[in-house]
């Protein structure tokens, strides 16, 4: 049979997902119901590995599968009739498959830094990079991330900095390739904690009796993490700035003369039965010298006529010595200190003085 050469196909339309493309086209020849079509699909920069698809007669659409996400392809479509008589020129169209979304990403806190490390494995296929969005309340930040390669299963990471401590962030990462954006991958991550900001003021100390005082102080600001505990520290010495080293000293050490500074009382804030919001400042009043015991710390009676100053340590993380039961490990804790109060001088023991006078 004799056939005239088919005219070229036109109006090629492509719809894609990550690994497939559905192509449709038109041919306006009267004889087009007798045509089949030959499709050549070639990945950009890889002409040696073209895929060929031949349609059934009269079919003007085809789906090509097993494509690579986020990649650029060119399709050529020839109309053909009879014994391989083809249109002179193919219809041509370039297209991109959709990029693959990141399966998931993990967050890690950075110790004592207001930052998060995000870690992920590269999604399959090609990508030009990623859009990163970080949001918390009214604050947000959008930035680009570099492209990655999925070939060797490498773990990729980026550090998100300039965040706030102990704050929950909504994070979204969107894969980009060929000007297309995948569905975003989301996670909610919370930044870590650090030493609390030291308070401006110092505690208020007042004499109650010849062997006890009352220490009043305001709760520390919780912007670096929730305050987990307070330690009330007394000294009879020169009131320099306290360090974490003093947290190991107890009333017993003080009585033995091993230290002029010691922890007399410990408050676990969880015991107060309510959580402290960032702006809420709680007031504390501690009776020092009432012979109570908190964990490894004995709140022993004070010395009549003694001169005492008080300071408060606030903890966002309190760690105890594994071998020294009930004593704080200052080096492992997240702690800061108030300034020392003014000194208070205790009165003499009137009863003892009276007794002494009678003898």
């Amino acid at each position: 049979a004799q056939y005239t050469r088919p005219s070229n196909v036109s109006n090629i339309d492509v719809s894609t997902n990550t690994t497939a493309a559905t192509l449709s086209w038109q041919n306006f020849d009267d004889a087009s119901p007798t045509y089949s079509y030959c499709l050549l699909i070639e990945k950009a920069g890889n002409s040696s590995n073209a895929t060929q698809v031949v349609t059934d007669i009269g079919i003007t659409d085809a789906t090509v599968t097993e494509l690579i996400p986020g990649s650029s392809y060119t399709v050529e479509i020839f109309a053909q009739v009879g014994d391989g008589i083809k249109s002179l020129e193919p219809g041509r169209k370039s297209f991109c498959t959709d990029p693959a979304s990141m399966a998931s990403f993990d967050c890690e806190v950075v110790p004592k830094e207001p930052a998060l490390v995000l870690k992920w494995t590269c999604p399959p296929g090609a990508n030009a990079g990623f859009e990163l969005e970080v949001s918390s309340g009214a604050w947000n930040n959008a930035t680009h991330l570099e492209s990655c390669s999925s070939e060797n299963g490498t773990e990729y990471r980026t550090e998100v900095t300039y965040l706030n401590f102990s704050t929950s962030y909504n994070i979204s990462i969107t894969t980009v390739s060929c000007g297309k954006m995948a569905a975003p991958t989301r996670n909610t991550c919370t930044t870590g904690i650090t030493d609390p900001p030291p308070p401006d003021g110092s505690p208020n100390i007042t004499s109650v009796s010849h062997n006890s005082v009352k220490v009043k102080f305001s709760g520390f600001e919780a912007s670096h993490g929730p305050i987990k505990a307070y330690a009330v520290i007394l000294t009879t010495g020169e009131a320099g700035h306290p360090s974490a080293d003093v947290l190991k000293y107890t009333y017993e050490d003080f009585k033995k003369g091993a230290s002029d500074t010691y922890v007399t009382y410990l408050i676990r804030t969880e015991e107060k039965g309510r959580s402290q919001s960032l702006s809420e400042v709680l007031k504390y009043e501690i009776d020092v010298g009432n012979e109570s015991t908190t964990l490894g710390y004995y709140n022993g009676k004070l010395e009549p006529l003694g001169s005492y100053r008080a300071c408060v340590a606030g903890f966002t993380n309190i760690t105890f010595h594994p071998q020294n039961k009930g004593l704080i490990d200052g080096a492992e804790s997240y702690v800061s200190f108030s300034r020392y109060s003014d000194a208070v001088s205790l009165p003499q023991d009137v009863a003892a003085a009276h007794h002494h006078h009678h003898h």
């Epitope: 030009a128 949001s135 959008a142 979204s172 000007g179 569905a183 975003p184």
Partner: antibody, heavy 117, light 107 residues
């Protein structure tokens, strides 16, 4: 095929308001960062505003901050630009665009906003 | 704001000629640079993003290169349909900014 169609432009007096819309089709609108770009008559291009996909974070050029509001309705695949306290220097053709990795990939045909008394 | 200085402001080229347009950024933009073509009365069209990947359907006679603060667009084998205004644009830092444009005409 990606299609972006802007509407809502027109003549408005200084101090007046206008709301532009951009109807998107041919792609998954909710996945995309979107932006408005404008072009004053016979002038160059100027980025105006930007909105992200996940949390709808917004960014504006300084000259429109506090006067313009970009928003999106993913269910309707539509991008908006509410323009208040309009000034003569806002006169321009306004284009909406997809904006992955900081590049304006697909553009609408534009809608003309004229601010004049 | 990051300034983009485009040069030349205008040029004319003969059919088949190769032309180059330069774009200089006031600071490092880490290859977040795009090139656009705009024809009279039409919307801009993306040619190149991220300094060198060619956008879908853009003829291969267009190419982009550069890094840091210096970028260029090259058009080989100038064709009549290449006439128009070309803009560079940085997408590294807000506010995103455009160059002033280069008008390309056929000689």
């Amino acid at each position: 095929e990606v299609k972006l169609v802007e509407s809502g432009g027109g003549l408005v007096q200084p101090g007046g308001s206008l709301k532009l819309s951009c109807a998107a089709s041919g792609f998954t609108f909710s996945n995309y960062y979107m932006a408005w770009v404008r072009q004053a008559p016979t002038k160059g291009l100027e980025w105006v505003a930007y909105i992200t996909n996940s949390f709808g974070s917004t960014y504006y050029r300084d000259s429109v901050k506090g006067r313009f509001t970009i928003s999106r309705d993913n269910a309707k695949s539509t991008l908006y630009l509410q323009m208040d306290s309009l000034r003569s220097e806002d006169t321009a053709t306004y284009y909406c665009s997809t904006v992955p990795l900081g590049a304006f990939v697909y553009w609408g045909q534009g809608t003309l906003v004229t601010v004049s008394s | 704001d990051i300034q983009l200085t485009q040069s030349p402001a205008s040029l004319s080229a003969s059919l088949g000629e190769t032309v180059s347009i330069e774009c200089l950024a006031s600071e490092d933009i880490y290859s977040y640079l795009a090139w656009y073509q705009q024809k009279p009365g039409k919307s801009p069209q993306l040619l190149i993003s991220h300094a060198n990947p060619l956008h879908d359907g853009v003829p291969s006679r267009f190419s982009g290169s550069g890094s840091g603060t210096q970028y260029s667009l090259k058009i080989r084998n100038m064709q009549p349909e290449d006439e128009g205004v070309y803009y560079c644009q940085q997408g590294y830092k807000f506010p995103y900014t455009f160059g002033a444009g280069t008008k390309l005409e056929l000689k």
